[in-house]
Interface confidence: low
């Protein structure tokens, strides 16, 4: 079976004009997934990103996340790229609200 992830991109403000953007994938199966941040379409180096472990979420599916820190005002330059079981999607940083996108089955 394949259950595509729900992808949820959020922002949290930190000091000195920086924000942390977090891309969360949840409720997916199987557990193999790729999440990475891109700036202007180019994947960020791994040392500028932080990943969470892929963990069971209690419903027979899995969840994980990737985060990076960016300059406030540059949100539109960043997207979260997801690959899962042959599906892929690009998810932008929301403007003022949480954006939830369901990947196509």
């Amino acid at each position: 079976r394949t259950v595509p992830p729900m992808v949820n991109v959020t922002c949290s403000e930190v000091s000195e004009g920086n924000i942390t953007v977090t891309c969360r994938a949840s409720s997916f199966y199987p557990r193999n997934i790729t999440l990475t941040w891109r700036q202007d379409g180019v994947s960020l180096s791994h040392n500028t990103q932080q990943w969470g472990d892929v963990l069971p979420d209690g419903n027979g599916t899995y969840q994980t996340w990737v985060a990076t820190r960016i300059r406030q005002g540059e949100e539109q330059r960043f997207t979260c790229y997801m690959e899962h079981s042959g599906n892929h999607g690009t998810h932008p940083v929301p403007s003022g609200k949480v954006l939830v996108l369901q990947s196509q089955r």
């Epitope: 557990r31 180096s45 690959e83 042959g86």
Partner: antibody, heavy 119, light 108 residues
Framework: QVQLQESGPGLVKPSETLSLTCTVS????????GHWIRQPPGKGLEWIGM???????DYNAAFISRVTISVDTSKNQFSLKLSSVTAADTAVYYC?????????????WGQGTLVTVSS | EIVLTQSPGTLSLSPGERATLSCTAS???????LHWYQQKPGQAPRLLIY???NLISGIPDRFSGSGSGTDFTLTISRLEPEDFAVYYC?????????FGQGTKLEIK
Amino acid sequence: QVQLQESGPGLVKPSETLSLTCTVSGFSLTTYGGHWIRQPPGKGLEWIGMIWTDGWTDYNAAFISRVTISVDTSKNQFSLKLSSVTAADTAVYYCARKGHGYYYAMDYWGQGTLVTVSS
Amino acid sequence: EIVLTQSPGTLSLSPGERATLSCTASSSVSSSYLHWYQQKPGQAPRLLIYSTSNLISGIPDRFSGSGSGTDFTLTISRLEPEDFAVYYCHQYHRSPFTFGQGTKLEIK
């Protein structure tokens, strides 16, 4: 059965462009990304770059001014172009598949093709 | 760039013995992005272990991997004749995504 096969000229003249194609079978390039790696004779492995399933590319900065990786999903092929070659670019060139969830590891490889740069 | 240094450069052992191959990174590498490959003469490399310790399907369980930070190890618990080859570690933690120089495992 997953297979990758490199093809292209075995001899390239200095200052010209090296062009190689990787033809894949047993999977689709719409669902798996691809890497190019090279190995000079008697030496170790060097990562050149990769292409993602949506066509975006990541390159080794050492090659970025002269490398292009592209994909033709209708032919199940992805390609490498390396311009302004010198003798230092003589190597066996491999294409490889980016495994799902293997954190960018290369889970299947072509057998490699030797490219010699010489006049 | 992250430099991966493998040691020893050559390891001479007999079938049945235990092999321990080391890979040291010049700066810290996430264990998720450290992989091991085997290459035999005239052949392409093949993936053995991904993310430090995860064995690829079809690879015998005499192979195992461990480590974290800057120090990683590939262990072959009991060498078989077909295990004599060159082994490479590889990091995809930071671009450029480098390989170690290889350890040649040869028959003593």
